[in-house]
């Protein structure tokens, strides 16, 4: 399940470099999977939030994105976040690139990894 | 229900190693929804996290950085208990040595403790 | 890491009282905060997790309140049992830190 989250995720990371223009050469930080859940493209000086994923949520592939970005872009996202709400993780896009994530998932979401044996 | 029993020696003498044990009864220390911790204790310090150790498939810790290049937690699945080595201690590990469980609701949280064992630094 | 302050340091009040101890964070923590009472030679207690939430079996006259940096513990009418030392601890990042305590004790 979780690799079939995986290819969703590069998936909506395409759609979403198309809807922003981006390509390998455009300045900001490029959309991941980060083995925990889907962070889209930003541009520097964005902050992105995503919700804790749910472990065994299967993505919606005709859901642009599920995740909140404060910053100059934002696609009307299905789901409003807030860094006042809990279960949310945070990234920086820099000019070093992504930040490390706040809370760490261990802290803001009760796990930090899928189990290995899943 | 939950239980801990902490046990060891409550003097140490400096540059020497701290070890701590603390059994678990009531709960299993592989429990996948639990994490096992080890806080300590003093007047100076106040009430100070140390680290923990946790079962998700394979066995993981965290440490605090202030203790780091120090500490080892290890768990004894065999026993059920999970144990504290700080190396190198010195007068300012003097303190009230606490293991308690971790649960998760919306945060970690420490929901039973062990009984405490002061541990004195001293030759 | 993150420091987490009381106030006050200590307080007297009266069986019956309600008291109010407040926490704060030096730095944003959304509501990643848990409150634990303690007795001389004993281990902390939990009483709140998620800056509001009752942990099981505790009296519901203990209630907790506020997010971002600023929180609350009340106790409504206190009762001989709640002269105790409070503490507030943060769980938003690690290492996890606690505040310096609360000591309530009997005016």
């Known amino acids: 399940i979780f690799k079939k989250e995986q290819a969703m995720c590069l998936e909506k990371i395409q759609r979403a470099n198309e809807l922003m223009g981006f390509n390998d050469s455009s300045p900001g930080c490029p959309g991941m999977w980060d083995n925990i859940t889907c962070w889209k493209p930003a541009h520097v000086g964005e902050m992105v939030l995503v919700s804790c994923p749910e472990l065994f949520r299967i993505f919606n592939p005709d859901q642009v994105w599920e995740t909140e970005t404060i910053g100059e872009s934002d696609f009307g996202d299905s789901n409003s976040l807030d860094l006042s709400d809990m279960g949310v993780v945070s990234r920086n896009c820099t000019e070093d690139g992504w930040s490390e994530p706040f809370p760490h998932y261990f802290d803001a979401c009760g796990f930090d990894e899928y189990e290995s044996e899943t | 229900q939950v239980q801990l029993q902490q046990s060891g020696p409550g003097l140490v003498k400096p540059s020497q190693t701290l070890s701590l044990t603390c059994a678990i009864s009531?709960?299993?220390?592989?429990?996948?929804?639990?994490?096992w911790n080890w806080i300590r204790q003093s007047p100076s310090r106040g009430l100070e996290w140390l680290g923990r150790?946790?079962?998700?498939?394979?066995?993981?810790?965290h440490y605090a950085v202030s203790v780091k290049s120090r500490i080892t937690i290890n768990p004894d699945t065999s026993k059920s208990q999970f144990s504290l080595q700080l190396n190198s201690v010195t007068p300012e590990d003097t303190a009230v040595y606490y293991c308690?469980?971790?649960?998760?609701?919306?945060?970690?949280?420490?929901?039973?403790w062990g009984q405490g064992t002061l541990v004195t630094v001293s030759s | 890491d993150i420091q987490m302050t009381q106030s006050p340091s200590s307080l007297s009040a009266s069986v019956g009282d309600r008291i109010t101890i407040t926490c704060r964070a030096s730095?944003?923590?959304?509501?990643?905060l848990n409150w634990y009472q303690q007795k001389p030679g004993k281990a902390p207690k939990l009483l709140i997790y998620?800056?509001?939430m009752l942990q099981s079996g505790i009296p519901s006259r203990f209630s907790g309140s506020g997010s971002g940096t600023d929180f609350t513990l009340t106790i409504n009418s206190l009762q001989p049992e709640d002269f105790a030392t409070y503490f507030c601890?943060?769980?938003?990042?690690?290492?996890?830190?606690f505040g310096p305590g609360t000591k309530v004790d009997i005016k």
């Open positions: 601890q943060q769980a938003i990042n690690q290492p996890y830190t």
């Open positions: 150790t946790y079962y998700r498939g394979k066995w993981k810790n």
């Open positions: 730095q944003y923590i959304v509501r990643y």
């Open positions: 308690a469980r971790g649960m998760w609701n919306q945060n970690w949280f420490l929901d039973h």
């Open positions: 009531g709960d299993s220390v592989s429990n996948k929804q639990a994490t």
């Open positions: 998620a800056a509001n």
